[in-house]
């Protein structure tokens, strides 16, 4: 037993974007710090077999499986994966440990399985077993949290029925508006399921797991705040719990709060009140209205009244199914090369949407902001003045929504030219789409001013590159024109660009005449 080497098995995660199949390697890449895999001698096995803890990898992730061996002398090795032998190149680190690595780039289903490493040292032979599996995120869920009253206590429990089990946290803020942004110093986070301090200005509960983070805000009417110009609206699906908090502050305790639904007092057991004195000895009262599982008849105007404040209402709308309301007609925009511009989508949705902006097959993160009128808006400004088609896509489990935008950048044409044995062709991507002229350069017209009236074929917008239109013009050569220089010019409202071509030659003439008008 004493002769057995000390073996360490590690996993290294890479932040690279290479695409390749598994390969044995000793070359480092941009990596995270190595993770120990708890390699241990496998009991009751024939021969000396070490086993590493099972490794779970995301699809397309890149990793290195690495073994560090404390053994005297040289080592030789062989990797075996699915009965195929893979080359193995051991090297020694600064501590004189043998290092053997297997790089798996862009993890796919075919690369999942058992990787066996056979090592032969001067003292002994042994095997190391790695099992690599693909993380199954299909079974994962992340549901928006909801609230429940804690039995026999004035406290709220936050629940999110998600897999893997989420971390639940309360996000509390006592300021108004912008200062309640997530990373503001006014925001306090409590990583617990039960909340007793229910008097704060802004109360949210968030749940997070491997799929991300979902939050629910405790809907609040504050009788000390000026009411919104539009009536606040709360959407819920049938069966979901309803929670509305009414909050009021007064100089003394001599006031009460009541909830009414369509001018009828709420039933006993569907509300509870809490009160406390604030630091300046004023009295804060909150009155919760709640329904554990809403039905269609819970729809209506919920009004919170106080003996010392003007009453305020909220419209609660119960829907059978979630929705996304927005205009899906496509929109075209034309901007200057340095003009500041953002795409914008205004929508009303329940439950909250998840969204993406897509351009040229690349997806960009999508931010959404709630407006005072109950609508939300998502803006996209990161277009870097690239013309083309931009797509906004939103979904919320019940509904999907897609909206197309076209961005055109006003600019002078830029001409590319090519020639073959029978024709000369020019193309340009300027905007507005250019018009074309062809001129012949001859002894009579050294400045290339002689028009070519025939044999020209213009194709406008024949090639769409991610929504970017390209215009082209082709000149069919006659025998009489061979050996001549011709000039194609593309022009639009922003200018003209030309290219000169020697007919019967394989490419453009080695200069561009770029006249600006």
């Amino acid at each position: 037993n004493q002769d057995l080497p000390v073996i360490k098995c590690v996993l290294i995660n890479h932040k690279n974007n290479d695409s390749s199949v598994g390969k044995s390697s000793s070359y480092p890449m941009v990596s995270e710090s190595p993770e120990d895999l708890g390699c241990a001698l496998r009991p009751q096995s024939a021969g000396t077999v070490y086993e590493a803890a099972t490794v779970e990898v995301d699809v397309s992730a890149s990793i290195t499986l690495q073994v560090l061996v404390d053994t005297p002398g040289n080592i030789s090795c062989l990797w075996v994966f699915k009965h195929s032998s893979l080359n193995c190149q051991p090297h020694f680190d600064v501590q004189n440990r043998g290092v053997v690595s297997m790089v798996i780039l862009k993890m796919t289903e075919t690369q999942a399985g058992e990787y066996l490493l056979f090592i032969q040292s001067e003292a002994t032979n042994y095997t190391i077993l790695f099992t690599v599996s693909i993380r199954n995120t299909l079974l994962f869920t992340l549901r928006r949290p909801y609230f429940r009253k804690m039995e026999n206590q004035d406290a709220l429990v936050c629940i999110s029925e998600s897999v893997p089990e989420p971390i639940v946290e309360w996000v509390l803020c006592d300021s108004q508006g912008e200062s309640c942004k997530e990373e503001s110093p006014a925001v306090v986070k409590k990583e617990e399921k039960v909340l007793h301090e229910l008097f704060g200005t802004d109360i949210r509960c968030c749940a997070r797991n491997e799929l991300g983070r979902e939050c629910t805000r405790l809907f609040t009417i504050d009788l000390n705040q000026t009411p919104q110009t539009t009536l606040p609206q709360l959407f819920l699906k049938v069966g979901e719990p309803l929670w509305i908090r009414c909050k009021a502050v007064h100089v003394n305790h001599g006031f009460g709060l009541t909830w009414e639904l369509e001018n009828k007092a709420l039933e006993e057991g569907s509300y509870f009140e809490m009160s406390t004195y604030s630091t300046n000895r004023t009295m804060i009262r909150i009155l919760f209205a709640f329904v554990s599982s809403v039905a269609r008849n819970d729809t209506g105007y919920y009004t919170c009244s106080s003996s010392k404040h003007p009453s305020q209402s909220a419209l609660v709308t119960i829907v059978e199914k979630g929705f996304i309301n927005a205009t899906n007609s496509s929109e075209d925009y034309e901007i200057d090369q340095y003009e500041e511009f953002c795409f914008s989508v205004r929508f009303k949705a329940y439950p909250q949407i998840r969204c993406t902006w897509t351009f040229s097959r690349k997806s960009f993160p999508c931010e959404q902001k709630g407006l005072d009128d109950g609508y939300s808006v998502s803006k996209f400004c990161n277009h870097k003045h690239q013309p083309g088609e931009y797509i906004f896509h939103a979904e919320n489990g019940d509904a999907q929504f897609t909206k197309m935008f076209t961005l055109n950048i006003r600019r002078k044409p830029q001409v590319l030219a090519e020639a073959s044995a029978s024709q000369a062709s020019c193309s340009s991507d300027g905007y507005p789409l250019p018009s074309w002229t062809w001129k012949k350069c001859s002894d009579k017209s050294p400045n290339c001013t002689e028009d070519i009236p025939e044999g020209v074929w213009n194709r406008k917008a024949n090639r769409k590159v991610f929504g970017q239109w390209v215009s082209s013009s082709t000149l069919n050569m006659s025998e009489a024109m061979k050996g001549f220089l011709v000039k194609c010019c593309a022009y639009n409202s922003l200018g003209t660009s030309c290219e000169t071509i020697l007919l019967n030659s394989p490419g453009p003439f080695p200069f561009i005449q770029d006249s600006i008008s």
């Epitope: 708890g38 241990a40 009991p43 009751q44 590493a52 990898v57 897999v163 089990e165």
Partner: antibody
């Protein structure tokens, strides 16, 4: 270098809830299948296993303390959290967390690496 | 719950002695047993897992044997650094349980 580090209050009052955190480094719960247990040891007494959380989030608890214990993990923070409600002076002990690698062959070597422990005293 | 009965609860021995500690499970636990060494004020350290497999880096004077219900830890030649408390742990079925410990003292 693999380490597990327990943290939490050194002193709690009877009836209060104890929350302990085990922060791991040198491995992650996201990529390697690792379970973590909490074990305690009252002064001068034997070790007592309390709870275990597997890589797939399955949990197991000590029979006698099941109603008072909750174990959870936060993969993003590389932490395992244990809560023990309604603390009593008999819960005074050193609390350890320990790692258990999960092998695809199905065998287990139990705890290969332990934290150094954190002493918790229950007193009013 | 499976009870683990460890014996003796303490023993006095000299450097160079052969020391035997036994652990008896109240029901069959197969090979799911580990042996741990603990020194005062320190965390336990794994010596043996799967009843008889020596932990990497642990001296070969430590050995484990047994399966089912009867398990033994042997220190073939006691060294000064071996004076400590030794625990067995069954992890065959929940709740996992430790033996009550064996304190090895200097004679």
């Amino acid at each position: 270098q693999v380490t597990l580090k327990e943290s939490g209050p050194a002193l709690v009052k009877p009836t209060e809830t104890l929350t302990l955190t085990c922060t791991v480094s040198g491995f992650s719960f996201r990529n390697a299948r690792m379970g973590v247990s909490w074990i305690r040891q009252p002064p001068g007494k034997a070790l007592e296993w309390l709870a275990h959380i597997f890589s797939n989030d399955e949990k197991s608890y000590s029979t006698s303390l099941k109603s008072r214990l909750t174990i959870s993990k936060d993969t993003s923070k590389s932490q395992v959290v244990l809560t023990l409600t309604n603390m009593d002076p008999v819960d005074t002990a050193t609390y350890f967390c320990a790692r258990m690698p999960e092998y695809s062959s199905g065998w287990s070597g139990a705890f290969d690496i332990w934290g150094q422990g954190t002493m918790v005293t229950v007193s009013s | 719950d499976i009870q683990m009965t460890q014996s003796p609860s303490s023993l006095s021995a000299s450097v160079g002695d052969r020391v035997t500690i036994t652990c008896r499970a109240s029901q069959d636990i197969g090979y799911d047993l580990g042996w741990y060494q603990q020194k005062p004020g320190k965390a336990p350290k794994r010596l043996i897992y799967a009843a008889s497999t020596l932990q990497s880096g642990v001296p070969s004077r430590f050995s484990g044997s047994g399966s089912g219900t009867e398990f033994t830890l042997i220190i073939s030649s006691l060294q000064p650094e071996d004076f400590a408390t030794y625990y067995c742990l069954q992890h065959n079925s929940f709740p996992w349980t430790f033996g009550q410990g064996t304190k090895v003292e200097i004679k």
